[in-house]
Amino acid sequence: IPTEIPTSALVKETLALLSTHRTLLIANETLRIPVPVHKNHQLCTEEIFQGIGTLESQTVQGGTVERLFKNLSLIKKYIDGQKKKCGEERRRVNQFLDYLQEFLGVMNTEWIIES
Amino acid sequence: IPTEIPTSALVKETLALLSTHRTLLIANETLRIPVPVHKNHQLCTEEIFQGIGTLESQTVQGGTVERLFKNLSLIKKYIDGQKKKCGEERRRVNQFLDYLQEFLGVMNTEWIIES
């Protein structure tokens, strides 16, 4: 991503800015934004990033809240870059099966699966 | 998903079938499939399932390997259903911010972030 800031530090700072500006951000009581109904967040990045755009457009411009939106833009850029890396390298079946096994293993242990 | 088997049991069984049929699946030594280069698997579901389609098309039909591909098809259906739930409900900004904070929190603690 086009930044000298490590992404991990960017995420930490963004979490702090989100807390700082929460009152300003929730000022619009009529605004409704799509919110995923499950906790498998990575499946919902498109909707999350769309929602941030809606939120920014309804937020009074100027001040340190702008840094929050800058950071969120860089995080989107990082995730878009990760998504591009999903299909970049063609490998042997063996390596694909390793990845598939890892994926299913993560599903098995870490996902919140509704019955 | 169109099954009486709980998804969690389906995932477990699929992991077992994957081990059972590994030798058959890797028989094609010339086949190359895109493999993600990072471990944030949920970002890559589209490419993973595309790869499964490629693999199935190159695998000798018949026998218990067919159950593996059936299971993988049901898992895809489950994930597609989860993706549909990403934008179904419009909520207050407060709830969107809660979800965004959770997402960033998961990124902060669980993601494998490259510097």
Partner: antibody
Framework: EVQLVESGGGVVQPGGSLRLSCAAS????????LNWVKQAPGKGLEWIGW????????DYAEKFKKKATLSADTSRNSAYLQMNDLRPEDTAIYFC????????????WGQGTLVTVS | DTVLTQSPSSLSASVGDSVTITCRAS??????LHWYQQKPGKAPKLLIY???KLESGVPARFSGSGSGTDFSLTIRSLQPEDFATYYC?????????FGQGTKLEIK
């Protein structure tokens, strides 16, 4: 009132370089990213890139990565577009423009400055 | 890069008419599609952002719609000052890109 004023345009010989300036006023300079947009005579708009004066971070369209360098001076509230190895196809009006930081849509534009490579 | 194709490239209309300009993206741009108006010798001006939101100070006769890959800008009851060139822009995918423009001329 937000104002963006470009300067530094003019006639330059092929192979030459030029630095365009964008003076910003009417808002806190470090709050927003600034974009540069090219418009060749009688043609459409092309996004060159943006700079965040606060972080000093930049992002470029691939085709302008070798051609353009963006910078900013927070003490002067100014952003700069340095262009090198100029060619006739670089002849254009160059706009400096402020966008929303996340949404990216441009809600303030400068008047533009004309660069002629001849 | 995400290619934005506007149609038509030019059109003629009369004062009072309604016109619609479309913008098609080569891949999804979510709702991050914006419309600008440009008059000769002037800088562009933002009309619609995030597909359908009207910029402050822009007359309500301008409206936008769409999501994903297909978008449109509609101008109802054209006024003399509306004859100009219109551009769409997407900011969802990198790099940010513009459509080639649609020139709206007086009939």
């Amino acid at each position: 009132e937000v104002q963006l004023v470009e300067s530094g345009g003019g006639v330059v010989q092929p192979g030459g370089s030029l630095r365009l300036s964008c003076a910003a006023s009417g808002y806190t300079f470090t709050d927003y990213v600034l974009n540069w947009v090219k418009q060749a005579p009688g043609k459409g708009l092309e996004w060159i890139g943006w700079i965040d004066p606060d972080y000093g971070t930049t992002d470029y369209a691939e085709k302008f990565k070798k051609k353009a360098t963006l910078s900013a001076d927070t003490s002067r509230n100014s952003a700069y577009l340095q262009m090198n190895d100029l060619r006739p196809e670089d002849t254009a009006i160059y706009f400096c423009a402020r966008s929303r930081n996340y949404g990216g849509y441009i809600n303030y534009w400068g008047q533009g400055t004309l660069v002629t490579v001849s | 890069d995400t290619v934005l194709t506007q149609s038509p490239s030019s059109l003629s209309a009369s004062v009072g008419d309604s016109v619609t300009i479309t913008c098609r993206a080569s891949e999804s741009v979510s709702t991050f599609l914006h419309w600008y108006q440009q008059k000769p010798g002037k800088a562009p001006k933002l009309l619609i952002y995030l597909a359908s939101k009207l910029e402050s100070g822009v007359p309500a006769r301008f409206s936008g719609s769409g999501s994903g890959t297909d978008f449109s800008l509609t101008i109802r009851s054209l006024q003399p000052e509306d004859f100009a060139t219109y551009y769409c822009q997407q900011t969802w995918n990198d790099p940010r890109t513009f459509g080639q423009g649609t020139k709206l001329e007086i009939k």
